[in-house]
């Protein structure tokens, strides 16, 4: 994770004037993976490549996001900043973020991680909740997710709200959860380790 | 691999201009951005501007604008780095820096 | 410009010691980068967006962060980590980096 948004703005820094005027045009037709919005065009088509970029990435996340500028730059007949900006990409997709432990592999990995274990308990004791969504912005949740919590009213309920998007999230996005937990409430996460 | 492998030192007078470079290897040298970092000695590293070589779109810190000038050559896939009217202040190392890598660094002293 | 505060500016540590090293934005920024310079050398990349290991980086250092508050962390101090830190940010342009913190080896 990460990567990708350096990436992304390698690529979009990458464009003459003229080819990023073209990509926003582009950005605005293409077709999206079903669940994500557009990016409004009036925001848009006044961005420069770093706003842009960091649009992307809130929209998106880091690797839909990606896919999709490359997609767009292959569009627009740049193949080759497309193949460069998937490879740089992947290229930092291996590694687990520091800090955290990498998953054991498939079969010893135990089934269910540590957030899902302790569901019930972290909706009604986490007291923290905009801790945690500003640690988890732009990295696993988008714009739209980040306001549907903090929309919420109560705190169980932003946090029941967080849970109905981590059906999607992969081992790594729900480390992250676990890390902001420990870095807010680590007296929260050592109770719930014992119990 | 990416290397990037900088110019040697630089003695130049006060009021002059000099030229560093910075020759890129072992990767698409259009792919990436090249920075270029400040460090005086005993000090911290300070950043002075990008280049995107493929389209040419820079960014300064307002600091060195006037006073440093960002090209790059894609045939010869060399950055470069222009300073002018010298002054001690502007003694230091001087890196280029990519993504993840960085040069060697140049040391420029500017003595009369 | 987004201004970077970094403490402490020089400490020193242990062997085994865990250190830690906080870098402060003057407003939020997304991610955090961290360099790893050694007297007479070039900067390392050693964290980059924030909690990712660089290549070759001990697992012994973890980044964490968000907003306008951002650490690095060595778990366990051992004499090749006396360096001096950079941390950098690069979500507004000019990019711009913290003022150090020099770790020493007790």
């Known amino acids: 994770m990460g990567r990708a948004r350096d990436a992304i703005l390698d690529a979009l820094e990458n464009l003459t004037a003229e080819e990023l005027k073209k990509f926003k045009l582009k950005l605005l037709s293409v077709p999206l993976r079903e669940g994500y919005g557009r990016i409004p065009r009036g925001a848009l088509l006044s961005m420069d490549a770093l706003d842009l970029t960091d649009k992307l990435v809130s929209f998106y996340l880091e690797t839909y996001g990606a896919e999709l500028t490359a997609n767009v730059l292959r569009d627009m007949g740049l193949q080759e900043m497309a193949g460069q900006l998937q490879a740089a990409t992947h290229q930092g997709s291996g590694a687990a973020p520091a800090g955290i432990q990498a998953p054991p592999q498939s079969a010893a990995k135990p089934g269910l991680h540590f957030i899902d274990q302790h569901r019930a308990a972290l909706i009604a004791r986490v007291t923290n909740v905009e801790w945690l969504l500003d640690a988890l912005y732009g990295k696993v949740l988008t714009d739209e997710q980040y306001q549907a919590v903090r929309a919420e009213p109560t705190n169980p309920s932003k946090m029941r709200k967080l849970f109905s998007f981590t059906p999607a999230w992969n081992w790594t996005c729900k480390d992250l959860l676990l890390q902001a937990l420990r870095e807010s409430q680590s007296y929260l996460v050592e109770d719930l380790e014992r119990s | 691999q990416v290397q990037l492998q900088q110019s040697g030192a630089e003695l130049a007078r006060p009021g002059a201009s000099v030229k560093l470079s910075c020759k890129a290897s072992g990767h698409t040298f259009t792919s990436y951005g090249i920075s270029w970092v400040k460090q005086r000695t005993g000090q911290g590293l300070e950043w002075i501007g990008k280049i995107y070589p493929r389209s040419g779109n820079t960014y300064y810190d307002e600091k060195f604008k006037g006073k440093a000038t960002l090209t790059a050559d894609k045939p010869s896939t060399t950055a470069y780095m222009e300073l002018r009217s010298l002054t001690s202040e502007d003694s230091a190392v001087y890196f280029c820096?990519?993504?993840?890598?960085w040069g060697q660094g140049t040391t420029l002293t500017v003595s009369s | 410009q987004i201004v970077l505060t970094q403490s402490p500016v020089i400490m020193s540590a242990s062997p085994g010691e865990k250190v830690t090293i906080t870098c402060s934005a003057s407003?939020?920024?997304?991610?955090m980068y961290w360099f790893q310079q050694k007297p007479g050398t070039s900067p390392k990349f050693w964290i980059y967006?924030?909690?990712n290991l660089a290549s070759g980086v001990p697992a012994r250092f973890s980044g964490s962060g968000s907003g306008t508050s951002y650490s690095l962390t060595i778990s366990r101090m051992e004499a090749e980590d006396a360096a001096t830190y950079y941390c950098?940010?690069?979500?507004?342009?000019?990019?711009?980096f913290g003022g150090g913190t020099k770790l020493e080896i007790k």
């Open positions: 950098q940010q690069r979500s507004r342009y000019p990019w711009t």
């Open positions: 820096a990519t993504r993840d890598y």
């Open positions: 967006s924030t909690s």
């Open positions: 407003s939020s920024v997304s991610y």
